[in-house]
C-alpha cells in the first residue's frame, strides 16, 4: 500500500453509485477520528478486489447500509 493510515483519510473521491450487496466482499465504515474528520465507507468488491469509497450522504448508499445490516441481523442467531 503506497500510503499508510497516517495519511489521515482513505478516500480521495467518493461515489454515489449504488452497489449490489451480492457483489460486495466487505463493507467498512470508518468513523471520524483524530486521523480523518469524516465518516468513510469503503466497499470491497468481489470482482478483482476493487475498493470503492462511497458517499455517506447519498440516499442510495444509506439504503445499501440498511440492506447490509438487515442481511447481517438475519444471519446472526
Amino acid at each position: 500500500i503506497p500510503l499508510s493510515r497516517t495519511v489521515r483519510c482513505t478516500c480521495i473521491s467518493i461515489s454515489n453509485q449504488p452497489v449490489n450487496p451480492r457483489s460486495l466482499e466487505k463493507l467498512e465504515i470508518i468513523p471520524p477520528s483524530q486521523f480523518c474528520p469524516h465518516v468513510e465507507i469503503i466497499a470491497t468488491m468481489k470482482k478483482k478486489g476493487e475498493k470503492r469509497c462511497l458517499n455517506p450522504e447519498s440516499k442510495a448508499i444509506k439504503n445499501l447500509l440498511k440492506a447490509v445490516s438487515k442481511e447481517r441481523s438475519k444471519r446472526s442467531p
Epitope: 500500500i1 500510503l3 489521515r8 473521491s13 469503503i42 476493487e50 470503492r52
Partner: antibody, heavy 124, light 109 residues
Framework: QVQLVESGGGVVQPGRSLRLSCTAS????????MHWVRQAPGKGLEWVAV????????YYADSVKGRFTISRDNSKNTLYLQMNSLRAEDTAVYYC?????????????????WGQGTTVTVSS | EIVLTQSPGTLSLSPGERATLSCRAS???????LAWYQQKPGQAPRLLIY???SRATGIPDRFSGSGSGTDFTLTISRLEPEDFAVYYC??????????FGPGTKVDIK
C-alpha cells in the same frame, strides 16, 4: 456536460508567482479528488499535485514541493494551483484532471476527466 | 522511487494491425495502481485503462490491458486511424505519489 476549464497561465519571470484556476461543471465537484499534471514542450506528462474531495489529503511531486500549493473551493467548484518561486523548468502546459469516482489509497481509478490545459512560460 | 519504462519508444504500424505496448516498472507495482492513457497532438490525455485491465467508460473493447508485478501490457487488437497517438502508462505509489512512463508513440507505417 462534464467539463474542466483551466485559466491563469501566462508569461512570468523566474522567481515570480502565478495562480492557476480550474473551474468544474457538469458533475458534483465536491465528491472528486483533483490533480494538476503538466507537460513541458515536446515532453511527456509529469504529475504535479493531488487534493482529495474534502481537501484532507494533499500530495506533491518532489520537483514542486515547498513552492507550489494545491487548494480547492468546493462552493465555487474551483481548483487552484499557487505557484511560487517559478523556474524556467516549470514552463509547461498545466492540466487539471479529475480522479475517478470512488478512488482511494487502496485502489486507483485513474484520472478520468481532463481540462484542455493552460500554458505557463517562465522566462526573463 | 519506482521508475516506469515504456517500449518501444515508437511503434510504426498500419491500420488493422495489432499493437502491443509494454510498460515495465523498476519495482513491483500492484495492478490496482496501474493506468494507461492516450494523448493525441494538441489534446489532453484520455484515460483508457485503470486497475491494469479495466476499461474506462466509453473505451472501445479493442483496447485491453494486462500484466502484474513489474510487467504490464496495453494491446490494441486492430488499429483504427484514430488510434495513432502517444500512449502513457502511469502508476500510483510512494514518493512521487503518481508517476508516468515516458510514452510510446504509435504512428502510421
Amino acid at each position: 456536460q462534464v467539463q474542466l476549464v483551466e485559466s491563469g497561465g501566462g508569461v512570468v519571470q523566474p522567481g515570480r508567482s502565478l495562480r492557476l484556476s480550474c473551474t468544474a461543471s457538469g458533475f458534483t465537484f465536491s465528491q472528486y479528488g483533483m490533480h494538476w499534471v503538466r507537460q513541458a514542450p515536446g515532453k511527456g506528462l509529469e504529475w504535479v499535485a493531488v487534493i482529495s474531495y474534502g481537501g484532507d489529503i494533499k500530495y506533491y511531486a518532489d520537483s514542486v514541493k515547498g513552492r507550489f500549493t494545491i487548494s480547492r473551493d468546493n462552493s465555487k467548484n474551483t481548483l487552484y494551483l499557487q505557484m511560487n518561486s517559478l523556474r524556467a523548468e516549470d514552463t509547461a502546459v498545466y492540466y487539471c484532471a479529475r480522479e475517478g469516482e470512488g478512488s482511494n489509497i487502496y485502489y486507483y481509478y485513474g484520472m478520468d476527466v481532463w481540462g484542455q490545459g493552460t500554458t505557463v512560460t517562465v522566462s526573463s | 522511487e519506482i521508475v516506469l519504462t515504456q517500449s518501444p519508444g515508437t511503434l510504426s504500424l498500419s491500420p488493422g494491425e495489432r499493437a502491443t505496448l509494454s510498460c515495465r516498472a523498476s519495482q513491483s507495482v500492484s495492478s490496482s495502481y496501474l493506468a494507461w492513457y492516450q494523448q493525441k497532438p494538441g489534446q489532453a490525455p484520455r484515460l483508457l485503462i485503470y486497475g491494469a485491465s479495466s476499461r474506462a467508460t466509453g473505451i472501445p473493447d479493442r483496447f485491453s490491458g494486462s500484466g502484474s508485478g513489474t510487467d504490464f501490457t496495453l494491446t490494441i487488437s486492430r488499429l483504427e486511424p484514430e488510434d495513432f497517438a502517444v500512449y502513457y502508462c502511469q502508476q500510483y505509489g510512494s514518493s512521487p505519489i503518481f508517476t508516468f512512463g515516458p510514452g510510446t508513440k504509435v504512428d502510421i507505417k
